[in-house]
């Protein structure tokens, strides 16, 4: 037989299929020009010493073969003895290691069998009613195709599916969408309506994320507040990355999960903007305010579930940094200014009440005064911190108040509101004899003592009603008792107690009269 012809003789090897797992497969035959044809196939297994034979049986029942040697592609003309206008059955037999391995058969009409391409270029993926929709441009001059897909997950083998007939300049396929695992898809096409035409190769992998992006498994920690009034937020664990099917490992566009940080500043509710989405790669520095932080995972189908953490406010207080002067027109606060043109947010809330009850005020941008101080004033009519109770005050600063990540904490402290000097007056002052020339003075703690750092000291005043001499005794804010000594028997005294803050002298308590009785010896 001539090498260019199909040889109508018995092939030069015994006719027996070994049935082994290796061997020829994926036989494709098609017309490549007006009079030339090509068949190609894959061979699975060791290729050394393998000889391939393309077998062909005509509709008459006569069969022939082409010897391809070690090649897995063979071309022939319409003069090679194979009927191209009528249906033929083709398969490959591979002779190796004294055994024959056979491919599955294809039955087709060679003249009408055109080589079809798989979807080429960009395959657009979208979600449609809980399913996956893939769409692509039909390859040139190949309108009219049957399309199949195969898909697998990281833990499952390939499954075959059908896209149905296509007859347009764009082709599409509806495929199953997995909720929680990534999938790899491949598509192939063959000529529509051409009986037994060969399938194209499989397309390049299309990698598809799960409908729900993986929920991030992360924890946050927050550092101590620095001298600049900011603290670093750090991520303790990186978000889990998606497990990918084999063909999607490495660079797999389409399956990327993007993690973002959503920051919600709970403190200072009167500021312009309360939330901001940030990159996980650029972890922010935060003020000492309270925040909610959420990690949002999203893929090409949109955002998934998020996890939210609460970052409590930094409660470190600096009792001396804030100066408060109360005048007839109202109250003014002074504190060390941060920089030029700063906006300050002053937030206050009654101690012991829910954080949601905080009130705040935003200043206009201000420069430091000649003493380097920033100020905030309010009138009595405004009602701000007007009740006689303890308030927790925090002052935040920003040169860009509309930018959430640029706020810093200036100070946190306590302040007793309303008429603190009167409200703080100690009550229930009592005097008890202590010795022949001394007494013990006790009183109930001032209301100011409920406000950390506000009560600077108690002052006990003792007045000799005879000589009108007055002595004053400072007492630590933690004490509610003092011993007055050097007193004379039979003399009338009055004692009063007041509670002072750093900026305000208290109001004296009601005078309490006492005397030490003269001791008469028997």
């Amino acid at each position: 037989c001539r090498t260019s012809e199909c040889c109508f003789q018995d092939p030069p090897y015994p006719d027996a299929d070994s049935g082994s797992a290796s061997g020829p497969r994926d036989l494709r035959c098609y017309r490549i020009s007006s009079d030339r044809y090509e068949c190609s196939w894959q061979y699975e297994g060791p290729t050394a010493g393998v000889s391939h034979f393309l077998r062909c049986c005509l509709s008459s029942g006569r069969c022939c073969y082409f010897a391809a040697g070690s090649a897995t592609r063979l071309q022939f003309s319409d003069q090679a003895g194979v009927s191209v206008l009528y249906t033929v059955t083709l398969w490959v037999e591979s002779w190796a290691r004294n055994q024959t391995e056979k491919s599955p058969e294809v039955t087709l009409q060679l003249y009408n069998s055109v080589k079809y391409e798989p979807p080429l270029g960009d395959i657009k993926v979208s979600k449609l009613a809980g399913q996956l929709r893939m769409e692509w441009e039909t390859p040139d001059n190949q309108v009219g195709a049957e399309v199949q897909f195969r898909h697998r997950t990281p833990s499952s083998p390939w499954k075959l599916g059908d896209c149905g007939p296509q007859d347009d300049d764009t082709e599409s396929c509806l495929c199953p969408l997995e909720m929680n695992v990534a999938q790899e898809f491949q598509l192939r096409r063959r000529q529509l309506g051409s009986q037994g035409s060969s399938w194209s190769k499989w397309s390049s992998p299309v990698c598809v994320p799960p409908e729900n992006p993986p929920q991030p498994q992360v924890r946050f920690s927050v550092e101590q507040l620095g001298q600049d009034g900011r603290r670093r937020l750090t991520l303790k664990e990186q978000p889990t990355q998606l497990e990918l099917p084999e063909g999607c490992q490495g660079l797999a566009p389409g399956t990327e999960v993007t993690y973002r940080l959503q920051l919600h500043m709970l403190s200072c509710p009167c500021k312009a903007k309360a939330t901001r989405t940030l990159h996980l790669g650029k972890m922010p520095y935060l003020s000492g305010a309270a925040y909610n932080v959420a990690v949002i995972s999203s893929n090409q189908f949109g955002p998934g579930l998020n996890q939210t953490w609460h970052i409590p406010a930094d409660t470190h207080t600096e009792p001396v940094a804030l100066n408060i002067s109360v005048g007839t027109n109202g109250t003014t606060m002074y504190w060390p200014a941060r920089a030029q043109s700063m906006t300050y947010c002053i937030e206050w809330q009654p101690v012991g009440q829910d954080g949601g009850l905080a009130t705040c005020s935003l200043t206009a941008p201000q420069d430091p005064d000649p003493a380097g101080m920033a100020t905030y004033s309010w009138s009595r009519e405004s009602g701000a911190m007007g009740q006689e109770k303890c308030y927790y005050i925090t002052i935040f600063a920003s040169a860009h108040p509309e930018k959430l990540t640029l706020w810093s904490t200036v100070l946190s402290t306590y302040h007793f509101g309303g008429n603190a000097s009167a409200a703080g007056t100690p009550h229930h002052v009592s005097v008890k004899n202590h010795s022949l020339d001394s007494v013990s003075v006790d009183w109930a703690p001032s209301l100011l003592s409920t406000c950390p750092g506000v009560l600077k000291e108690y002052v006990v005043r003792c007045r000799d009603e005879d000589s009108k001499q007055v002595s004053e005794h400072p007492v630590q804010p933690t004490e509610t008792q003092v011993t007055l000594s050097g007193l004379r028997a039979g003399v009338a005294y009055t004692v009063q107690v007041r509670a002072d803050t750093a900026w305000l002298r208290g109001v004296w308590s009601q005078p309490q009269r006492f005397s030490i009785e003269v001791q008469v010896s028997d």
């Epitope: 990327e256 973002r260 972890m283 999203s298 990540t405 640029l406």
Partner: antibody, heavy 117, light 110 residues
Framework: EVQLVESGGGLVQPGGSLRLSCAAS????????MNWVRQAPGKGLEWISY????????YYADSVKGRFTISRDNAKNSLYLQMNSLRDEDTALYYC??????????WGQGTTVTVSS | QSVLTQPPSVSAAPGQKVTISCSGS????????VSWYQQLPGTAPKLLIY???ERPSGIPDRFSGSKSGTSATLGITGLQPGDEADYYC???????????FGGGTKLTVL
């Protein structure tokens, strides 16, 4: 007035080194993240490097990774770019830029780096 | 080759409106904020739009920004000769952990 002023550019041979500086004034430098961006003659902007306010997070473009080093000295209100193993393609106008939440709101006037033998 | 794609040039007559597009992917524009910069001839870039559609103080409301999916658009109405400049879009790319710019668009006012 908020201002950034770059310096340190010049002519250098391939394989040589340069250190660019950026002096900041008119704002609290230590609170802001900073970037270097370059522009080759007649070309577009190319981001080079990012450093956060306390130098704890740094990023580089692939084109300069391993050759360039960004740093800052908050006490001196200064940003730096150490450029080693310079190549012809590093020839550009180099800008430093202040970043606020993903946008570069203040830019310097740039300093020119020419790499040529 | 820029990560973000912009048209090389656009032109329009004074008083007209023009739009400049910027397209990217889910790892940059799709999930991050977009900024627009104006670079007048011989000067440093200047921030024009931040957070997709916000204008810094001093930028006239003739300039606007928008974002949809993985694309962003800069709009300029009432064109003036002084608007002739190069315009760049910029954002962060979460996959690259890098800043990215478009190739720039030269605006000519006819």
């Amino acid at each position: 007035e908020v201002q950034l002023v770059e310096s340190g550019g010049g002519l250098v041979q391939p394989g040589g080194s340069l250190r660019l500086s950026c002096a900041a004034s008119g704002f609290t430098f230590s609170s802001y993240d900073m970037n270097w961006v370059r522009q080759a003659p007649g070309k577009g902007l190319e981001w080079i490097s990012y450093i956060n306010s306390r130098s704890s997070t740094i990023y580089y473009a692939d084109s300069v990774k391993g050759r360039f080093t960004i740093s800052r000295d908050n006490a001196k209100n200064s940003l730096y770019l150490q450029m080693n193993s310079l190549r012809d393609e590093d020839t550009a106008l180099y800008y430093c830029a202040r970043e606020i939440e993903d946008s570069m709101d203040v830019w310097g006037q740039g300093t020119t780096v020419t790499v040529s033998s | 080759q820029s990560v973000l794609t912009q048209p090389p040039s656009v032109s329009a007559a004074p008083g007209q409106k023009v739009t400049i597009s910027c397209s990217g992917s889910s790892s940059n524009i799709g999930n991050n904020y977009v900024s627009w910069y104006q670079q007048l001839p011989g000067t440093a870039p200047k921030l024009l739009i931040y957070d997709n559609n916000e204008r810094p103080s001093g930028i006239p409301d003739r300039f606007s920004g928008s974002k949809s999916g993985t694309s962003a658009t800069l709009g300029i109405t009432g064109l003036q000769p002084g608007d002739e400049a190069d315009y760049y879009c910029g954002t962060w790319d979460s996959s690259l952990s890098a800043g990215v710019f478009g190739g720039g668009t030269k605006l000519t006012v006819l």
